[in-house]
Interface confidence: medium
Amino acid sequence: FVRTKIDTTENLLNTEVHSSPAQRWSMQVPPEVSAEAGDAAVLPCTFTHPHRHYDGPLTAIWRAGEPYAGPQVFRCAAARGSELCQTALSLHGRFRLLGNPRRNDLSLRVERLALADDRRYFCRVEFAGDVHDRYESRHGVRLHVTAAPRIVNISVLPSPAHAFRALCTAEGEPPPALAWSGPALGNSLAAVRSPREGHGHLVTAELPALTHDGRYTCTAANSLGRSEASVYLFRFHGASGAST
């Protein structure tokens, strides 16, 4: 659902912070948050600032990739004296504020996680009005997205000398181990990882020479689960057919 205001309880500001006269800017974020693909994750971020009881206009921002220059994935703004932080940007509608900037809390909730969300995120707050000031986390919080294996492509392709090879590509985190089984491979699982392994959570295994007709099965496995898919090779007078 979409919030039109900011949450008032998840994150109260604090503190002793306000009783110390020379409070400096600081941001507190954990080094890493882990969650499974498809689930939601909370990226915590709280801050302190030197402007005692600031109630002027503020903007809360989250970036991805790198601080200061990375693309924004979330932004909201609150008017003077208001607790309502109106969302101006929520990438794909999946980012929403969990914290309350008026409580010095910028914690963000990310819905429906995908492997592509596995990157570093940086929170930032901007004050405008009587006070003009801003601060951004320098190191950010790394969102580590885990996922059970999923085979994204399996195919049979022609290779020189009227032979055939099979390719299996899977994604997952941790990167899955791939194995081929099929005719004449016996009980031994043949797996050859391509140089692209690990690139964007994708792993590819090639079976370079299919010497017998029949069913070839690719199995992908990691600590979160396993997945398998098959192709069938039939050769008729030099032609081939494959189905998944």
Epitope: K5, T8, T9, E16, T46, E83, N104
Partner: antibody, heavy 116, light 108 residues
Framework: QVQLVESGGGLVQPGGSLRLSCAAS????????MHWVRQAPGKGLEWVSY????????YYADSVKGRFTISRDNSKNTLYLQMNSLRAEDTAVYYC?????????WGQGTLVTVSS | DIELTQPPSVSVAPGQTARISCSGD??????VHWYQQKPGQAPVLVIY???NRPSGIPERFSGSNSGNTATLTISGTQAEDEADYYC???????????FGGGTKLTVL
């Protein structure tokens, strides 16, 4: 499922101390702000204290400031409230509550009685 | 500090609509949350952020916040809704959370 279980309540004399604990389970404790709320017998709810997800930010109601200290141990999924210089008016059921969109989950409470 | 004022009691016949008010300064610029508390039990969040229902809370519970008054509305009130109800908000100036005094809802 989310569960919060308070402990540590009991009878204490005025001026005494008590430490309450709140054991959390069923959610990522280290990602959420937490609160203590109390309710005197036959009275309404009174917010007591707040602590941010990491423990770096805390805040207190005026009625307990300087006497109570909120803390947390994220490695143990536990929230604490150290109560010193207790007064008769601190007598109440003390609840820990998770902070998100209101206090969305509450423990069942622990009774603190301050009496001589 | 902000003060939230609730009527001490509200009565309603079964099946009718109960409305519990909560008044305070500048409420439209604040979130208001509502809790139900039955005797001997911990409070339960029934409305958050003015008008959102947590999962598991019946649809007959709704909330609004306009002017300087927030309202909890219970449509088709049932006997099991008899309880104390508290509104709550956050005061960004005193940096504290504030509860209303509570309203006892009686289902006649």
């Amino acid at each position: 499922q989310v569960q919060l279980v308070e402990s540590g309540g009991g009878l204490v004399q005025p001026g005494g101390s008590l430490r309450l604990s709140c054991a959390a389970s069923g959610f990522t404790f280290s990602s959420y702000a937490m609160h203590w709320v109390r309710q005197a017998p036959g009275k309404g709810l009174e917010w007591v204290s707040y602590i941010s997800y990491s423990g770096s930010n805390t805040y207190y109601a005026d009625s307990v400031k300087g006497r109570f200290t909120i803390s947390r141990d994220n490695s143990k999924n536990t929230l604490y409230l150290q109560m010193n210089s207790l007064r008769a008016e601190d007598t109440a059921v003390y609840y820990c509550a998770r902070g998100w969109g209101g206090f969305d989950y509450w423990g069942q409470g622990t009774l603190v009685t301050v009496s001589s | 500090d902000i003060e939230l004022t609730q009527p001490p009691s509200v009565s309603v016949a079964p099946g009718q609509t109960a409305r519990i008010s909560c008044s305070g300064d500048n409420l439209p610029n604040r979130y208001v949350h509502w809790y139900q508390q039955k005797p001997g039990q911990a409070p339960v969040l029934v409305i958050y952020d003015d008008n959102n229902r947590p999962s598991g809370i019946p649809e007959r519970f709704s909330g609004s916040n306009s002017g300087n008054t927030a309202t909890l509305t219970i449509s088709g009130t049932q006997a099991e809704d008899e309880a104390d109800y508290y509104c709550q908000t956050y005061d960004m100036f005193s940096m504290s959370d504030v509860f209303g005094g509570g309203t006892k809802l009686t289902v006649l």
